[in-house]
Amino acid sequence: KESCDVQLYIKRQSEHSILAGRPFELECPVKYCANRPHVTWCKLNGTTCVKLEDRQTSWKEEKNISFFILHFEPVLPNDNGSYRCSANFQSNLIESHSTTLYVTDVKSASERPSKDEMASRFWA
C-alpha cells in the first residue's frame, strides 16, 4: 500500500527555457491521499524564497496526478529566475526542489543566449 505522505515532485535542477510574451504553466506535481494540502509558490531571491501571493495559480487533476500550477500570462523578462513550491500538511512544511526559468526576449530569440549566459546574468 502506498504511503500517504505528501510529496512534491519538481525535478531537481530542472530548467525551462521559455519565450517572453507567451503563456506558460509551471507545474508542481503534488502527491497526496485524502486531503489536498495547501500549496504555494515562491521565487528565490538570494537565500530567501519570496511568496508569490498575487499571482494566478490553479489545480489541475489529470490521470491520477495532481498539479499545482503557477500561470504566466504572459511570460515577462523579469520572470527569469528560480521557483519553488511548498505544501502545508498536518502542520508540516514540505518544500520542493527549485526549478529555473530562463526567459528569452522574443526579439532576441534568433540570437538566443546559452543557459550558462542566462544563469550568469540572473545570478550577477
Epitope: Y9, R12, S14, E15, H16, S17, I65, F67, I94
Partner: antibody, heavy 118, light 111 residues
Framework: EVQLQESGPSLVKPSQTLSLTCSVT????????WNWIRKFPGNKLEYMGY???????YFNPSLKSRISITRNTSKNQYYLQLNSVTTEDTATYYC????????????WGHGTTLTVSS | DIVLTQSPASLAVSLGQRATISCRAS??????????MHWYQQKAGQPPKLLIY???NLESGIPARFSGSGSRTDFTLTINPVEADDVATYYC?????????FGGGTKLEIK
Amino acid sequence: EVQLQESGPSLVKPSQTLSLTCSVTGDSITSAYWNWIRKFPGNKLEYMGYISYSGSTYFNPSLKSRISITRNTSKNQYYLQLNSVTTEDTATYYCARSHYYGYYFDYWGHGTTLTVSS
Amino acid sequence: DIVLTQSPASLAVSLGQRATISCRASETIDSYGDSLMHWYQQKAGQPPKLLIYRASNLESGIPARFSGSGSRTDFTLTINPVEADDVATYYCQQTDEDPYTFGGGTKLEIK
C-alpha cells in the same frame, strides 16, 4: 494505453550521425518527461537524456557534446540525434516515459537495435 | 554519478523458493523525502518492465510475489515464491539525481 515506438536505421557507419524517432500514442508529449535509454551488448543500461513537457532537455554528461533531443508536438514524436558515432555506440535504443511522481519509467518502447560498423 | 551495485550478478533458485536481490547506492537516495529507487525485469528480446517504484510500491498488474524494501543506500527486491516465468535479468534504477543510473543487473535462473 500509452505506447511508444522507436524507428530508425539498424546500421550506421562510424563518424556518421544516428537519428532515431519515438512515436507516442495514448499520451501527449507536452505532459511528463520523455527519455532515451540504451542497452549495450554486455547488458549494461545507460541513461541518455530526456525532453520535458516544456521542451527543456537534459543530457547525460558522458554524451553531452554529441547528443540532441528534440520534439514535434503536432506529430507527438520526439527524436534522438547522436553525432560522430563509433562502434561503442552499438546498442539497443529505447524510448520511455517518466512518471511525474518519481520519474520511474512506466512505459517503454520495444527498442531498436543499432550496429555501428564500416 | 550515483553508482548502483547489484548483488549477486547471477542467482539460481529452486521453484517455490525465495529470491533476494540487493542494490547498494554510492549516495543516499532520499532528496525528495522519498526513495526514488525502482526495479525492472527484462526478459530476452523485450524492453525492461517496471515492477516496483519508489522502493516499495508494486506496479499495477505485477504479481504480489514481487516486493521491494529499503531506504537511503540499501534496497532489496524479493521474489517469493519464484515461478518459472521469473527467469529474467533484474535491474535497479535511481532517479533521485541526474544522470539517472542503473545497476549492473542480476540474472535469475531456475535451479
